[in-house]
């Protein structure tokens, strides 16, 4: 059994040159003829030199999975899916995303350090002492209120609540 060169494929005991991206094998090589290739039909593709008898079906971006079509399929490139706004890719295979998750909402006591993108979740960070956040999409923690001279501090602020002041 011969070992074929890179970008050749084995047919019986012969090595045939592969087809170009965007094509598939229509007729394998013989003594006097090279590999005859045919263009991929619509909605199919081959991204690399190949010995495939059929092109691969183009991926479909499922809106129920939070996906939208970012780049249409071509004969030599699969469909590129992206997550809809507010979602990020959970399962990425090369440039193909199969499932999306909603961006994390920062809990009370935390602020948004890095906004979520189509391929990254939101990054949250704790509020420093003396500041608080109600969570959500807040990017800055707010400083606790300083009760005025005419007010009494009823409850000290926490990382998720402001100081509570009361009038005397």
């Amino acid at each position: 059994q011969p070992s074929c060169r890179q970008e050749e494929f084995l047919v019986g005991d012969e090595c045939c040159p592969m087809c170009n991206p965007g094509y598939h094998v229509k007729q394998v090589c013989s003594e006097h003829t090279g590999t005859v290739c045919a263009p991929c039909p619509p909605q199919t593709y081959t991204a690399h030199a190949n010995g495939l008898s059929k092109c691969l079906p183009c991926g479909v971006c499922d809106p129920d999975m939070g996906l939208l079509t970012w780049q249409e399929c071509s004969s030599w490139k699969d469909t590129v899916c992206r997550c809809i706004p507010g979602y990020f890719c959970e399962n990425q295979d090369g440039s193909h995303c199969s499932t999306c998750l909603q961006h994390t909402t920062c809990p009370p006591g935390q602020r948004v350090e890095k906004r979520g993108t189509h391929d990254q979740d939101t990054v949250c960070a704790d509020c420093l002492t003396g500041t608080f956040s109600l969570g959500g999409t807040q990017e800055e923690c707010l400083p606790w209120t300083n009760c005025s001279a005419f007010q009494q501090e009823v409850r000290r602020g926490t990382n998720s609540t402001d100081t509570t002041c009361s009038s005397q």
Partner: antibody, heavy 115, light 108 residues
Framework: EVQLLESGGGLVQPGGSLRLSCAAS????????MSWVRQAPGKGLEWVSS???????YYNPSLESRFTISRDNSKNTLYLQMNSLRAEDTAVYYC?????????WGQGTLVTVSS | EIVLTQSPGTLSLSPGERATLSCRAS??????LAWYQQKPGQAPRLLIY???SRTTGIPDRFSGSGSGTDFTLTISRLEPEDFAVYYC??????????FGQGTKVEIK
């Protein structure tokens, strides 16, 4: 004697059309794949299209579906219909037998695309 | 597409000398490579197919070798009528069939 004779070339304006013919003699035309190869002035050879004996057709992807190859086995003739011609299509167009290596060539017909 | 690169671009030699022309493919084309000779104002003529098989009527001073990505056309002793442009062409994976840019063999 095995022979291929092209005709139909000439001067055409950009955007125009032209149909080239290639008359074959001296061999069983229907048994062979046939091809068109072109050569721009002072440049190298460029494959244009092939039609197999089965009737399957193949084109250079760079031509963007502007050309159509066909054959009439009863007339031993190969054709190339060229539409939406551009200045860069100016070349000598050769008809050749074969779809792999081209063993018989015609003398070529000059196509000039110019306004 | 498979790109064929021929070297040198021009070869200046005297009659009787040996000419060695190279053709390199961007990826393997197996043995499916042809060589053509073209003289000014004429159609190309097939010399070699299948990398090493001579076409009927081609003198044995022309020989081809190689497989995969590296190919050579050798003219053992140049005759005056051999000065011309030579093209390699792959048909290992088609379409598209592709040609090299050519090597001109000129008289020194």
């Amino acid at each position: 004697e095995v022979q291929l004779l092209e005709s139909g070339g000439g001067l055409v304006q950009p955007g125009g059309s032209l149909r080239l013919s290639c008359a074959a003699s001296g061999f069983t035309f229907s048994n062979y794949g046939m091809s068109w190869v072109r050569q721009a002035p002072g440049k190298g050879l460029e494959w244009v299209s092939s039609i197999y004996y089965s009737g399957d057709t193949y084109y250079n992807p760079s031509l963007e579906s502007r050309f159509t190859i066909s054959r009439d086995n009863s007339k031993n003739t190969l054709y190339l219909q060229m539409n939406s011609l551009r200045a860069e299509d100016t070349a000598v167009y050769y008809c050749a037998s074969g779809s792999n290596a081209f063993d018989i060539w015609g003398q070529g017909t000059l196509v000039t695309v110019s306004s | 597409e498979i790109v064929l690169t021929q070297s040198p671009g021009t070869l200046s030699l005297s009659p009787g000398e040996r000419a060695t022309l190279s053709c390199r493919a961007s990826r393997s084309v197996g043995k499916y490579l042809a060589w053509y000779q073209q003289k000014p104002g004429q159609a190309p003529r097939l010399l070699i197919y299948g990398a090493s098989s001579r076409t009927t009527g081609i003198p044995d001073r022309f020989s081809g070798s190689g497989s995969g990505t590296d190919f050579t056309l050798t003219i053992s002793r140049l005759e005056p009528e051999d000065f011309a442009v030579y093209y390699c062409q792959q048909y290992g994976s088609s379409p598209p069939v592709t040609f090299g840019q050519g090597t001109k063999v000129e008289i020194k």
